[in-house]
């Protein structure tokens, strides 16, 4: 069956049952997700607006899918397996009386079961499993997943163990104000800009002149040197780092376990062996991947490549190319393209270069 092909999953509570305090609903749902994140590499984050992977809905009777609820008792809730649109969504029958305790129907216990479905689990034949098809109250303070539940979810996503350490080659620190300095990759991370070169990165905090040099391994011991491309999805606190045909996911500045993964999971053809540069545009919710003289566009919501790509860089980014080393997005309208020791400020609304700079101009050189 289907699984989520990523480890950072968002959820949104569409509406609240009047049976409970909002805070209790939030807490029950958060703890239910935590049950599954404790035994997998998955990380769940609640968002309050926009399109989440998993939508939590309280509804009665007919509610927009084929599976109308049946009033009090009977079907308590249902959830769809991983996927886009309705995929992953969890629906709770508003005709039940939802509670934080043993009276009525316990929201936390029901949510743990439904989120199991949202993550791709089917029903279990083990009566001790939370994925057993019938509801039975157990003390929520001592609640544990059964061995069968854990086996099932880990067969889909693995366990939460850390990656193994990877060796780093020993390069000397490049001179920051060398006029010939080029970068391997550049990305924003919140209000900072990370510039990668060999086994080092420089950190530039927006609007402050001071920069600091760091070893990549000092911040992320499991990552290799020579990062070749990087991009950030700030709304998700995610940074993607690329080297050769692999990529790593950083969430909230921490490497996600079970990485690296193959770049081909993004949908690149087999001949693509590495990414030169990448940039995410939050206005379009698309990531642009630059490979040699071409680029691909990837839909981050639907997690698939847009049709009609690759395209030539020179054809669609006037004055840029044929190849680039690095790129990042800033100030809501600019891409900063790096080619060797030169940098181009490119207004993607006007679709033209607005400034030419040295690559290290950010450092007051």
């Amino acid at each position: 069956g289907p699984v989520w092909r990523k480890h950072y999953i968002t959820y949104r509570i569409n509406n609240y049952t009047p049976d409970m305090n909002r805070e209790d609903v939030d807490y029950a749902i958060r703890k239910a997700f935590q049950v599954w994140s404790n035994v997998t590499p998955l990380k769940f984050s609640k968002i309050n607006t926009g399109m989440a992977d998993i939508l939590v809905v309280f509804a009665r009777g007919a509610h927009g899918d084929f599976h109308a609820f049946d009033g009090k008792g009977g079907i308590l809730a249902h959830a769809f397996g991983p996927g886009s649109g309705i995929g992953g969504d969890a629906h709770f029958d508003e005709d039940e009386f939802w509670t934080t305790h043993s009276g009525g129907t316990n929201l936390f216990l029901t949510a743990v079961h439904e989120i199991g479905h949202s993550l791709g689990l089917g029903h279990s034949s083990d009566p001790k499993a939370v994925m057993f098809p019938t509801y039975k109250y157990v003390d929520i303070n001592t609640f544990r997943l059964s061995a069968d539940d854990i086996r099932g979810i880990q067969s889909l996503y693995g366990d939460p163990k850390e990656n193994q350490r990877l060796p780093n080659p020993d390069n000397s620190e490049p001179a920051l104000c060398d006029p010939n300095l080029s970068f391997d990759a550049v990305t924003t991370v919140g209000n900072k800009i990370f510039f990668f070169k060999d086994r080092f990165f420089w950190l530039k905090v927006s609007e402050r002149p001071k920069t600091s040099v760091n070893l990549i391994s000092s911040l992320w011991p499991t990552l290799p040197s020579g990062i070749e491309a990087a991009y950030e999805i700030e709304a998700r606190n995610q940074v993607f780092l690329f080297k050769d045909d692999k990529y790593w996911l950083i969430s909230n500045l921490r490497p996600e376990p079970n990485y690296p993964k193959s770049i081909h999971s993004f949908g690149f053809p087999n001949f693509v062996k590495k990414i030169d540069a990448a940039v995410f545009n939050p206005r379009f919710y698309r990531t642009y991947f630059f490979v040699d003289n071409q680029y691909w566009r990837y839909d981050e919501r639907r997690q698939m490549m847009d049709p009609g790509y690759p395209k030539l860089i020179t054809k669609n980014f006037q004055g840029i190319g044929p190849k680039i080393d690095a790129v990042f997005y800033s100030k809501n309208k600019y891409y900063y393209f790096f080619q060797g020791s030169n940098q181009f400020e490119y207004d993607f609304l006007l679709q033209r270069i607005t400034k030419t700079l040295k690559s290290n101009s950010w450092f007051g050189c």
């Epitope: 809905v57 927009g64 899918d65 959830a79 769809f80 996927g83 886009s84 309705i86």
Partner: antibody, heavy 122, light 103 residues
């Protein structure tokens, strides 16, 4: 490439029976919910029936309940619609359509066959 | 049962026009609404799912919006191949269709 090909349509008298088939290829048929949707001449689309990947869950529109039976043979990658007690108002092009994977139907019809015409007339 | 009301039932427009079709549900269906295009003698084709997500291979001039009860399909700049009938749908309920004709 996903392909759906309906067959079995034709002219039948009121009260008669007909069995439609839909041959599927290009995807793991047994994973997906499948549906029948019909369209009377010059009219809009009307959902008729749906069946889960395993065949264990079925659903019907009120207008056909008790008269039509949806089934599938996953070993043959084929979907069926057995239509009994046919009426003039069942005259339509019948399309089979693919839905999503999973225990519940989303009603998201991403691939459709070309349709087969059923005419109920005396 | 939930009812879907689509408007207008027919619409005349010219190539290059911006066109909007609306669909209203009788009660909240969250974002569980899909849009299809059908040309004469052909099977319907999925354009937009989950109210606003563009189906793979569909041109970006098509867009969808809305949640709850009110939904919109917009074609930003009509092309000759866009003249067709458009249906909204949630679960087993289709709107009655909007026929888009050349002015």
């Amino acid at each position: 490439e996903v392909q759906l090909l309906e067959s079995g349509g034709g002219l039948v008298q009121p009260g008669g029976s007909l069995r439609l088939s839909c041959a599927a290829s290009g995807f793991t048929f047994s994973d997906y919910w499948m549906h029948w949707v019909r369209q009377a001449p010059g009219k809009g689309l009307e959902w008729v029936s749906g069946i889960s990947g395993s065949g264990g869950s079925t659903m019907y529109a009120d207008s056909v309940k008790g008269r039509f039976t949806i089934s599938r043979d996953n070993s043959k990658n084929t979907l069926y619609l057995q239509m009994n007690s046919l009426r003039a108002e069942d005259t339509a092009v019948y399309y089979c359509a693919r839905d999503i994977v999973g225990p519940y139907s989303a009603g998201l019809f991403d691939y459709w066959g070309r349709g087969t015409l059923v005419t109920v007339s005396s | 049962d939930i009812q879907m009301t689509q408007s207008p039932s027919s619409l005349s427009a010219s190539v290059g026009d911006r066109v909007t079709i609306t669909c209203r549900a009788s009660q909240s269906i969250y974002t569980y609404l899909n849009w299809y295009q059908q040309k004469p003698g052909k099977a319907p084709k999925l354009l937009i799912y989950a109210a606003s997500s563009l189906q793979s291979g569909v041109p970006s001039r098509f867009s969808g919006s809305g949640s709850g009860t009110d939904f919109t399909l917009t074609i930003s700049s009509l092309q000759p191949e866009d003249f067709a009938t458009y249906y909204c749908q949630q679960a087993g309920i289709f709107g009655q269709g909007t026929k888009l004709e050349i002015k």
